[in-house]
């Protein structure tokens, strides 16, 4: 029966049992960002802590160079939130000066990169029209979902604007991934 | 080494196989909240349910005096909602009065406290500001993520203001977490 | 005992172990909806997309009409997240006209379905009061948590105005749940 | 420009604890954006890693499993610095001593160091 | 710990060549992988970062390269002012570790 386990004793070849300490896992933490150049229409990723304070990364979870690498297939429950600060966004300096009232955004996505695929692909978004009536406005956007990955995808953070990005404190800015 | 784990293969000896029902699990519900003194640079923590509804805590997850009990040294998701609720914020009272425009806002931390540390640590903060235009408003700030935890280690959820809580219902305000 | 569980040391007997691969998961993405009648005080529940694209039901995890079917039972992890979209809320055009403020407001509520029992019961909730001053307006809310499920509870996500929900992209809106 | 300044006596003998002071200036000790380190050099290790302290949530401290029994580090923000202290020294711990900043960002490096101090540990 | 390898552990070469230092990782950490110039009396200097950036101040002559476990320091045209011992060092890890230096020499 394949959700039920009174199991023959061979059945192990087929889906192993294992340890959960053993299983790739990580929580990353944010850190200064560095301006860098980017396609015009595409979303600057974010750099990541992987050791210092509460980050870390594990058995065979590996952080290099933006990307989480994933290094055994399987399901994984994926999160990030991003905590953006600005001053008065232009939505209502454009309201005030009585032209027509586009909002600004904030947005973040939790993309895959297959080599073996040519795009990326937009595993989580979140966006957020931003028109703010304070001066000074700051806000996060939390994502988290199961995605079925293979091993040797990447996963990455993007953000519409680095720039707006609060960096300041760990707890405040995060991505991680694990195993189920 | 923190960062990396490149196990042997019979790391099954440290790591033994546990059947998943008897994880340490816990989630928690918004109930009433009694104003409580609190030190000025210091977020109120929010007392919970643990029993009553959908409140449950199971396999020695312990709930006491506002804190999660940690049984057991592990990595755990961690997770928390809380649902804010007011009348117009300070924020455009201000603004209607042309004094400077700062923005209120609401804060929700998961903080750990370990015997033998004695500062607390913040794991997750969801913050916001609010500055709203409509009279009554509400809203909600959502965490989660994983951690690793030790025995004996205790977990609370704070927020800036108690008062502004909504305790209504517990599907709005909540707080959990489990072994991974 | 709900609360506690100071198990004996054989508990394996009743709780075998058992592969992870093997688990009921499913993550489910948007679709277009078509609008359907509800009774007055009774959000209107999602359709799902189940097998497309980032999509998937696996292990007797099944959605059939709005619904998750919870094959086996158990703790699971419970999460969706709804994008909203809509032009200027009615709360600015009412304050606009001098009528008194009451904000309009966006709700998500994760809702379980026992046969046994006569009433849903709503896990999840996040609502937020939308009183946007720029003409176009959009936002996440995102909802996790962890329930007790039973072998035959049904789960849904009804949403406060299923035509402000934003079905453009599946990485925007998602329904998922696991076994732990 | 960020300068540190390193102070602490010249000679340690044997068995005694060796105390150094590293005074930052041009940044803060409680900088999210660093960790403050102890290094030392000896014509027989070369050079070696021995500790560091940071602030991120709280304080956090690593040793190097060498001397992690007998160093610590402690900050000091009221003074903008912090320090070394290394029980139970003996010959082998003679070495050039050197704080140094590591600037964590997209990358990390140890970019702005100490003097150095010289310590013989000899009775 | 990580093992950094360096070589040559020293060599001797002439104003204007060419100069090449390799290291070598114990184990792959992408380009978290930092070079330094230490000159006698001196504590050492940030060179290169990230494997391949130069460090403000620091003469164009100077480049690095490599990701992995292999990387390279190339002096391009040696300076009498270049006369130092050059360092490569992880910070993926920790702890931080260092190769044991080459010591460069003018003919």
């Known amino acids: 029966l394949k959700g039920q386990e009174f199991a023959p004793s061979h059945q192990q070849v087929y889906a192993p049992l294992r340890a959960d300490g053993d299983k790739p896992r990580a929580h990353l933490t944010v850190v200064r960002q560095t301006p860098t150049q980017h396609f015009k229409n595409q979303f600057p990723a974010l750099h990541w802590e992987h050791e210092l304070g509460l980050a870390f990364t594990k058995n065979r979870m590996n952080y290099t160079n933006k990307f989480l690498l994933i290094p055994e297939s399987g399901d994984y429950f994926i999160y990030s939130q991003v905590t953006f600060r600005g001053m008065t966004s232009e939505c209502s300096e454009i309201r005030q000066a009585g032209r027509p009232n586009k909002p600004d955004s904030i947005t973040v996505v939790i993309t895959k990169v297959t080599d073996s695929y040519p795009e990326p692909t937009q595993l989580l978004m979140g966006t957020k029209s931003v028109c703010e009536v304070g001066s000074n406005w700051f806000q996060p956007i939390y994502l988290g979902a199961m995605f079925s990955l293979q091993e040797g995808d990447k996963l990455m953070v993007n953000v519409s604007d680095i720039s707006l990005v609060d960096y300041t404190k760990e707890d405040k800015t995060f991505f991680g991934a694990f195993l189920l | 080494l923190k960062g990396q784990e490149f196990a042997p293969s019979h790391q099954q000896v440290y790591a033994p196989l546990r059947a998943d029902g008897d994880k340490p699990r816990a989630h928690l519900t918004v109930v009433r909240q009694t104003p409580t003194q609190h030190f000025k640079n210091q977020f109120p923590a929010l007392h919970w349910e643990h029993e009553l509804g959908l409140a449950f805590t199971k396999n020695r997850m312990n709930y006491t005096n506002k804190f999660l009990l940690i049984p057991e040294s592990g990595d755990y998701f961690i997770y928390s909602q809380v649902t804010f609720r007011g009348m117009t914020s300070e924020c455009s009272e201000i603004r209607q009065a042309g004094r400077p425009n700062k923005p209120d806002s609401i804060t929700v931390v998961i903080t750990k406290v370990t015997d033998s540390y004695p500062e607390p640590t913040q794991l997750l903060m969801g913050t916001k500001s609010v500055c709203e235009v409509g009279s009554n408003w509400f809203q909600p700030i959502y965490l989660g993520a994983m951690f690793s935890l030790q025995e004996g280690d205790k977990l609370m959820v704070n927020v800036s203001d108690i008062s502004l809580v909504d305790y209504t219902k517990e599907d709005k305000t909540f707080f959990g977490a489990f072994l991974l | 005992l709900k609360g506690q569980e100071f198990a004996p040391s054989h508990q394996q007997v009743y709780a075998p172990l058992r592969a992870d691969g093997d688990k009921p998961r499913a993550h489910l993405t948007v679709v277009r909806q078509t609008p359907t009648q509800h009774f007055k005080n009774q959000f209107p529940a999602l359709h799902w997309e189940h097998e497309l694209g980032l999509a998937f039901t696996k292990n007797r995890m099944n959605y059939t009409n709005k619904f998750l079917l919870i094959p086996e039972s158990g703790d699971y992890f419970i999460y969706s997240q709804v994008t909203f979209r809509g032009m200027t809320s009615e709360c600015s055009e009412i304050r606009q006209a001098g009528r008194p403020n009451k904000p309009d407001s966006i709700t998500v509520v994760i809702t379980k379905v026992t046969d046994s029992y006569p009433e849903p019961t709503q896990l999840l909730m996040g609502t937020k009061s939308v009183c946007e001053v720029g003409s176009n307006w959009f936002q996440p809310i995102y909802l996790g948590a962890m329930f007790s499920l039973q072998e035959g509870d049904k789960l849904m996500v009804n949403v406060s105005d299923i035509s402000l929900v934003d079905y453009t992209k599946e990485d925007k809106t998602f329904f998922g749940a696991f076994l732990l | 420009q960020v300068q540190l300044q390193q102070s602490g006596p010249g000679l340690v003998k044997p068995s005694q604890t060796l105390s150094l002071t590293c005074a930052i200036s041009?940044?803060?000790?409680?900088?999210?954006?660093?960790?403050w380190n102890w290094i030392r050099q000896s014509p027989s290790r070369g050079l070696e890693w021995l500790g560091r302290?940071?602030?991120?949530?709280?304080?956090?401290?690593d040793y190097a499993v060498s001397v992690k029994s007998r160093l610590t580090i402690n900050p000091d923000t009221s003074k903008n610095q912090f320090s070394l202290q290394l029980n139970s020294v003996t010959p082998e711990d003679t070495a050039v001593y050197y704080c140094a900043r590591e600037a964590v960002g997209p990358t990390k490096d140890f970019d702005y160091w100490g003097q150095g101090t010289l310590v013989p540990v000899s009775s | 710990d990580i093992q950094m390898t360096q070589s040559p552990s020293s060599l001797s070469a002439s104003v204007g060549d060419r100069v090449t230092i390799t290291c070598r990782a114990s184990q792959s950490f992408s380009s978290y992988l930092n070079w330094y110039q230490q000159t006698p009396g001196k504590a050492p200097k940030l060179l290169i970062y990230?494997?391949?950036s130069l460090q403000s101040g620091v003469p164009s002559r100077f480049s690095g390269s490599g990701s992995g476990t292999y990387f390279t320091l190339t002096i391009s045209s040696l300076q009498p002012e270049d006369l130092a011992t050059y360092y490569c060092?992880?910070?993926?890890?920790?702890?931080?570790?260092f190769g044991q230096g080459t010591k460069v020499e003018i003919k």
């Open positions: 041009g940044d803060s000790v409680s900088s999210n954006s660093a960790t």
């Open positions: 302290t940071y602030y991120r949530s709280k304080w956090y401290n």
């Open positions: 060092q992880q910070s993926y890890f920790t702890p931080r570790t």
């Open positions: 990230a494997a391949s």
